[in-house]
Interface confidence: low
Amino acid sequence: CDLPQTHSLGSRRTLMLLAQMRKISLFSCLKDRHDFGFPQEEFGNQFQKAETIPVLHEMIQQIFNLFSTKDSSAAWDETLLDKFYTELYQQLNDLEACVIQGVGVTETPLMKEDSILAVRKYFQRITLYLKEKKYSPCAWEVVRAEIMRSFSLSTNLQESLRSKE
């Protein structure tokens, strides 16, 4: 399954929306910085598009879940959040269409299950951090910057897969 060209553009738009959501400078939040342990190797190890798509889907689904909470709605501009949801939703649709077309519908390899679990644990660490920091503006800014970084790394993987084919 070939992801449409619009999917790549949608990824760029998602990054740009995350950038627009910035409310305060990360420089003023240096004491709140945290290493969430993004499981980069889980993306780098998936050489088959069939293996990668479910992991990417999980990543985007978790971002959607994170930013669609009540606490998130209070933290960010409503209009930007709505645009952000729309972009994520479209990307989930693109990825789901690939799964329906037969990519990854065979038995799920254990390696892929492990990768999905690693992504879920990563987002659990982010959620726990936000709770511990009582959803402070700096905590949200640290998380916004982290999601930009991890989303960018995962979309770079998509691009490298596209160029390999």
């Epitope: 740009m16 950038a19 400078s25």
Partner: antibody, heavy 115, light 107 residues
């Protein structure tokens, strides 16, 4: 994607005033906006910024008291009012969408201050 | 005020060359730095934001790196359309400031 078009530039005498406009082809209500200028053969210089609703304005220290920035979201237009103009204000003035970084720019309007 | 110092101020290179431009700030600015390309008579065009992210339609030969106060723009293989002036801009401290520019000329 928004497109920005500046207007209002031209030749003005030292001490004179000009009001520059920046019209957007779609909604800029949710974006901070900035003015950036560039003197002939020189680099880029930030002039000032305004928040989405216009409640917060920031002008570079060197222009305070002479330049004011405003916006009319109902007209999707940004303004730069320049008073007491000097020869060193001669430059191309750009408006831009400001996300911290500036991702959408107008084509610029030339302001020439000369007697 | 955060002063941004770009180097070199100009350079001559050939098509296919790898080109590196640096931007140093007087204060740390986390990753809040952008790179722009400007051609004569045209408005600047955003290339990279937040230190490393490409804007729409920016070729992958352009890459940004660095954080804190030292940043780099790299063009991996210079193309004829890349001859232009490049500016960095910090937005981590107020007021937002631009570097003085680096002119990339044909050797």
């Amino acid at each position: 994607m928004s497109q920005l078009v500046e207007s209002g530039g031209g030749l003005v005498q030292p001490g004179g005033s000009l009001r520059l406009s920046c019209a957007a082809n779609n909604d800029i209500e949710f974006n901070a906006m900035s003015w950036v200028r560039q003197a002939p053969g020189k680099g880029l210089e930030w002039v000032g910024s305004i928040s989405p609703k216009g409640g917060s304005k920031s002008i570079h220290r060197k222009f305070q008291g002479r330049f004011t920035i405003s916006r009319d979201n109902s007209k999707n237009t940004l303004y730069l009012q320049m008073n007491s103009l000097r020869a060193e204000d001669t430059a191309v003035y750009y408006c831009a969408r400001d996300l911290g970084f500036m991702d959408i720019w107008g084509q610029g309007t030339l302001v020439t201050v000369s007697s | 005020k955060t002063q941004m110092t770009q180097s070199p101020s100009s350079l001559s290179a050939s098509v296919g060359d790898r080109v590196t431009i640096t931007c140093d700030g007087t204060y740390g600015i986390s990753n809040e730095l952008a790179w722009y390309q400007q051609k004569p008579g045209k408005a600047p065009k955003l290339l990279i934001y937040d230190g490393e992210y490409h804007d729409f339609d920016v070729p992958s030969r352009f890459s940004g790196s660095g954080s804190g106060s030292d940043f780099t723009l790299t063009i991996s293989s210079l193309q004829p359309e890349d001859f232009a002036t490049y500016y960095c801009q910090q937005y981590g401290n107020w007021p937002h400031t631009f570097g003085q520019g680096t002119k990339v000329e044909i050797k």
